[in-house]
């Protein structure tokens, strides 16, 4: 048994944030559970991760320098994603593992979500002043 | 899915009892299996449960040094040994299949019941 | 541990009466709640599970309501095959503690 994700197939980080939801067809408020974002083709850099247990609070952390947070809601956990930049423009995969009670669950892998960095655009400032008027 | 129980003991005070679960159906290691005990007048008591893939086990604080949950992967059978009895032990007891609803839990599937006496 | 208490402990009720007991919990099981039925000397039958989805083959007047901390089983038309034991079950962390049981009997 697999779980289903579902992700909106793209996004637009205008201001360098992004809310980057995972619905689940799996509810994980009774459940110790592992969601992670994934960056990549091949998943290769893990984003961040939330990390639940229906006793305690949620732990949300990164290990490879995103700024990230995590909410959970019954059947989803979104990310939320702040300071990206335009070269982090890639797909992005949402995961998820039930670790407990057992068995051990995880998901198929889902369609991503292609997260489109757009930079800031802010007027640069002139280098010289204008010529003043008298 | 079946779960067929062992059949009905009669025991002395201070002796123990091991009542076996024999599952059919369906894969064994992949669901865990509760055990129940209803006493006569008395509502159901949950007693724990045993997942026989990782042979993870969880008790009722009230059943520890009374119960203890075993299986044999072989036969795909769990076992419930109730040990030191006292008449208070006496009761139906039920093995439960527990299935995972899309993250809700239940008991859909139940053994017949073994009845345990304890009598001097 | 999470505290079941089940009410009423017994109801006395006719064919065709709309019955209804009740489950609260000392703290909120978010859904993690399922009702089943027992006759004596039978085991239990599964009737409800996460407090409101109704098991395939069980009788469209049995229904499931509540959350947070408090849940309902109704039967809407009491018929005889009705009569007997429930009991409400949550599955919020361990020990998955049983209610108290309602004795269903005929009036």
């Known amino acids: 048994n697999k779980i289903l994700v579902k992700q909106s197939p793209m996004l637009v980080a205008y201001d360098n944030a992004v809310n980057l939801s995972c619905k689940y067809s799996y509810n994980l408020f009774s459940r110790e559970f592992r969601a992670s974002l994934h960056k990549g083709l091949d998943s290769a850099v893990e984003v961040c991760v939330v990390y639940g247990n229906y006793s305690q609070q949620l732990q949300v952390y990164s290990k490879t320098g995103f700024n990230c947070d995590g909410k959970l809601g019954n059947e989803s956990v979104t990310f939320y994603l702040q300071n990206l930049y335009v070269n982090q423009t890639d797909i992005y995969f949402c995961k998820i593992e039930v670790m407990y009670p057992p068995p051990y669950l995880d998901n198929e892998k889902s369609n991503g979500t292609i997260i489109h960095v757009k930079g800031k655009h802010l007027c640069p400032s002139p280098l010289f002043p204008g010529p003043s008027k008298p | 899915v079946q779960l067929q129980q062992s059949g009905a003991e009669l025991k002395k005070p201070g002796a123990s009892v091991k009542v076996s679960c024999k599952a059919s159906?369906?894969?064994?290691?992949?669901?865990?299996i509760h055990w129940i005990k209803l006493r006569s007048g008395q509502g159901l008591e949950w007693i724990g449960w045993?997942?026989?893939?990782?042979?993870?086990?969880q008790y009722n604080a009230q059943f520890k040094g009374k119960a203890t949950l075993t299986a044999d992967k072989s036969s795909s059978t769990v076992y419930m040994e109730l040990t030191g009895l006292t008449p208070e032990d006496s009761a139906v007891y039920f093995c439960?299949?527990?299935?995972?609803?899309?993250?809700?839990?239940?008991?859909?599937?139940w053994g017949q019941g073994t009845l345990v006496t304890v009598s001097a | 541990d999470i505290q079941m208490t089940q009410s009423p402990s017994s109801l006395s009720a006719s064919v065709g009466d709309r019955v209804t007991i009740t489950c609260k919990t000392n703290e909120n099981i978010y859904s993690n709640l399922a009702w089943y039925q027992q006759k004596d000397g039978k085991s239990p039958q599964l009737l409800i599970y996460a407090a409101t989805h109704l098991v395939e083959g069980v009788p469209s007047r049995f229904s499931g309501s509540g959350s947070g901390t408090q849940y309902s089983l109704t039967i809407s038309s009491l018929q005889p095959e009705d009569f007997g034991n429930y009991y409400c079950q949550h599955f919020w962390g361990t020990p998955n503690t049983f209610g108290g049981g309602t004795k269903l009997e005929i009036k």
């Open positions: 159906g369906y894969t064994f290691t992949e669901y865990i």
């Open positions: 045993f997942y026989p893939g990782s042979n993870d086990i």
């Open positions: 439960a299949r527990r299935d995972d609803f899309s993250g809700y839990d239940a008991l859909p599937y």
